[in-house]
């Protein structure tokens, strides 16, 4: 690329006119703070380009960098361009205006920065200083890019004197940004709402100092915008937080709300969403099934636990055969609900050593204002067996029987078994069961009678033993589900004394 | 300019309360966090509470926890330190200040205002 | 809770002297330290934040420095002006000032 004049400096005076031509052998062109101004362009008979840039009545305001450059880069070995700075010295003209952002100027690290005050005539000594300091700074100054330096967080000017008048620039502001990468946290007051009430989402990031919130949510896509509250959370530097508020939520509020979150200085970004539910009225529902009949342990501990889902928060309450239970003073019912989740709730009723007077019909209520749901079970009071009487006895009629009585819940099992041979029996010999209708020599007679008041079974059996030849070795196995119990007894010949 | 003037002060039996006004201007106030910082006797300067531009959220030093309410008004551009159960540790020069938005060091301060609690 | 301990608690210097004082945090503050000066019966000024950033009108004869737990704050040549009390304030985690400096002139 040639450029005529070629500079690399040119001053040129105010309201005159100026010619500059670019030529290449490829399409040239001339540019002017990033546009092409009006120029003649050209292809000469020996196949070079050039470009005619005419300035006219110039003015300080013409002051500055103009480019030749290929028009059309495409193929060829390099992107050449030509630059060349132009003043025009206007009296009228103090620093040249700067667009808004060139006036806040932004830096995560200490590094080398420039202050862009410039004038329209490089022999005008120009000084930098903090906005509200007469100091001059000593700071080196070029006339075409401005003062160039490490600044400390803070606000300058730049002064000049033009004639007999002191002139100042706008002020520029040198930021230093905490800037790290980003990482976006969000969540609700409540993620379930009824229609009516409010919604209220909170984004918050930590340790950047420029971020830009933006919100996605379902009520934005049907034009219906909410205008975002950011907060600057004061518990450690730059925890910022933007609040989303959605007052009187409708159903069409339901679903994906989405915090986007953008650092413009590494241009570093980071989103996070959450689901919101809108339910036209509270509810209450049970989660698991809890069977109709649930059992607990005399003299041991029980804990019956009810699941269920909620919102509102629901009221929960415990009957016991109608009566309300609450915790006991002391300390043999103990009631508690927990929220394990936003909505999912626990309700236990542990019975401490449990009585056989707890046993009965239980009913756990979950309640507002908008639902109720109840779940009703019998708890039966299992007793462990006791064998509470072995007897023999020799009626007239010449047999001999044992009486075996006791009593459980539920209802005991009764085994009868024998040893005829007492020296090896029952550890080497395995003891016979007895009562078996097929044995003719035994016949055995069970009576089960339900207790009402002590709620639990008394079985009573006996065994008629039709003739006993030597010493026998007679036991009485009783068994439920929580237990077992044995009492043995020896039962001798009519003929021999015990 | 930014301008803070505190109002309220003045002396207080222990256990009595009092209220303390900041009236600002020269900002936006609702896009700044305001603070209360006190000085007693002869003492160094000791932060007592914060409070969020929103208003949404507030902080306190822990012995003034339970006993002082921090809070504004961004229609009057005003803070108030409501001062409950009142004890004769309390007695200082209390001033208003202002957070940075983001990094949190106190900005701007009012001139004190003198809280003397004293049967 | 961060505690600060500030020193000296006063310091005599004469005018063009340089004084130093010193702030030490409880735990690390990473750079998070502000400084005040404080005049009876004026509102308290800022003027140094993050460390060593000097507030806009703070004369270049003070500056600061320090990391982790340990700063100080320097006035290069004292100036009758500069008499007065400073403190120190951490606001890594809420806010904690130091127990301050009487600054006096010899």
């Known amino acids: 690329l040639v450029v005529t004049p070629p500079g690399p400096e040119l001053v040129l005076n105010v309201s005159s006119t100026f010619v500059l031509t670019c030529s290449g052998s490829a399409p040239v062109v001339w540019e002017r703070m990033s546009q092409e101004p009006p120029q003649e362009m050209a292809k000469a008979q020996d196949g070079t380009f050039s470009s005619v840039l005419t300035l006219t009545n110039l003015t300080g305001l013409d002051t500055g960098e103009y480019f030749c450059t290929h028009n059309d880069s495409r193929g060829l070995e390099t992107d050449e361009r030509k630059r060349l700075y132009i003043f025009v010295p206007d009296p009228t003209v103090g620093f040249l205006p700067n667009d808004a952002e060139e006036l806040f100027i932004f830096l995560t690290e200490i590094t080398e920065i420039t202050i862009p005050c410039r004038v329209t005539d490089p022999q005008l000594v120009v000084t930098l200083h903090e906005k509200k300091g007469d100091v001059a700074l000593p700071v080196p100054y070029d006339h075409q890019r401005g003062f160039s330096g490490i600044f400390e967080d803070r606000s300058y000017i730049c002064k000049t004197t033009i004639g007999d008048r002191e002139v100042d620039s706008d002020a520029y502001y040198v930021y230093r940004l905490q800037v790290s990468s980003i990482n976006v946290s969000v969540n609700a007051v409540q993620t379930v709402v009824r229609q009516g009430e409010n919604i209220t989402l909170m984004c918050i990031v930590i340790g950047n100092e420029v971020v830009n919130f933006e919100w996605t949510y379902p009520r934005k896509e049907s034009g219906r915008l909410v205008e975002p509250v950011t907060d600057f959370l004061l518990d450690m530097p730059y925890h910022i937080r933007s609040i989303l508020h959605i007052p009187s939520a409708e159903l069409e509020d339901s679903g994906t709300y989405t915090c986007n979150v953008t650092e413009s200085v590494n241009d570093h970004q980071d989103e996070k969403a959450i689901n919101i539910t809108v339910v036209e009225s509270g509810y209450v529902r049970l989660l698991g099934e809890v069977g109709t009949l649930q059992f607990a342990e005399l003299h041991r501990s029980r804990t019956l636990q009810v699941v269920f889902e909620a919102y509102p928060p629901p009221t929960v309450l415990w009957f016991k055969d109608n009566r309300t239970l609450g915790d006991s003073s002391a300390g043999e019912i103990a009631l508690s609900t927990r929220n394990v989740s936003e909505t999912r709730y626990v309700s236990e009723l542990t019975l401490v050593r449990v009585k056989v007077a707890e046993a009965g019909h239980y009913t756990m209520r979950a309640f507002h204002e908008d639902a109720e749901v109840q779940l009703s079970f019998q708890l039966q009071i299992n007793v462990p067996v006791r064998v509470l009487e072995l007897s023999e006895s020799h009626p007239d009629s010449g047999e001999q029987t044992v009486r075996c009585r006791g009593r459980g819940m539920p209802q005991p099992n009764i085994i009868w078994s024998a040893c005829r041979d007492l020296k090896r029996c029952p550890r080497e010999l395995p003891p016979t069961l007895l009562g078996n209708s097929s044995e003719e020599e035994s016949q055995l007679e069970t009576n089960v009678t339900y207790w009402e008041e002590e709620q639990e079974f008394e079985v009573v059996s006996t065994l008629r033993l039709q003739h006993v030849d030597r010493p026998l070795s007679v036991r009485c196995t009783l068994r439920n589900a929580v237990g077992q119990d044995t009492q043995e007894v020896i039962v001798v010949p009519h003929s021999l004394p015990f | 300019e930014v301008q803070l003037v505190e109002s309220g002060g003045g002396l207080v039996q222990p256990g009595r309360s009092l209220k303390l006004s900041c009236a600002a201007s020269?900002?936006?106030?609702?896009?700044?966090?305001m603070a209360w910082v006190r000085q007693a006797p002869t003492q160094g300067l000791e932060w007592v509470a914060s409070?969020?531009?929103?208003?949404?959220?507030?902080y306190y030093r822990d012995s003034v926890k339970g006993r002082f309410t921090i809070s504004r008004d961004s229609a009057k551009n005003t803070q108030y330190l409501q001062m409950d159960s009142l004890r004769s540790e309390d007695t200082a020069t209390y001033f208003c200040a202002r957070h940075t938005p983001g990094a949190n060091y106190f900005d701007y301060w009012g001139q004190g205002l003198m809280v003397t609690v004293s049967s | 809770d961060i505690q600060m301990t500030q020193s000296p608690p006063s310091l005599s210097a004469s005018l063009g002297e340089k004084v130093t004082i010193t702030c030490q945090a409880s735990?690390?503050?990473?750079?998070?330290i502000a400084w005040y000066q404080l005049k009876p019966g004026t509102a308290p000024r800022l003027l140094m934040r993050y460390t060593s950033t000097l507030e806009s009108g703070t004369p270049s004869r003070f500056s600061g420095s320090g990391s982790g737990r340990d700063y100080s704050f320097s006035i290069s040549n004292v100036e009758s002006e500069d008499i007065a009390s400073y403190y120190c304030?951490?606001?890594?985690?809420?806010?904690?000032f130091g127990g301050g400096t009487k600054l006096e002139l010899k």
């Open positions: 304030v951490q606001y890594a985690n809420l806010y904690t």
């Open positions: 020269g900002f936006t106030f609702s896009n700044y966090g």
């Open positions: 735990q690390s503050i990473k750079n998070y």
């Open positions: 409070i969020t531009n929103s208003g949404g959220n507030t």
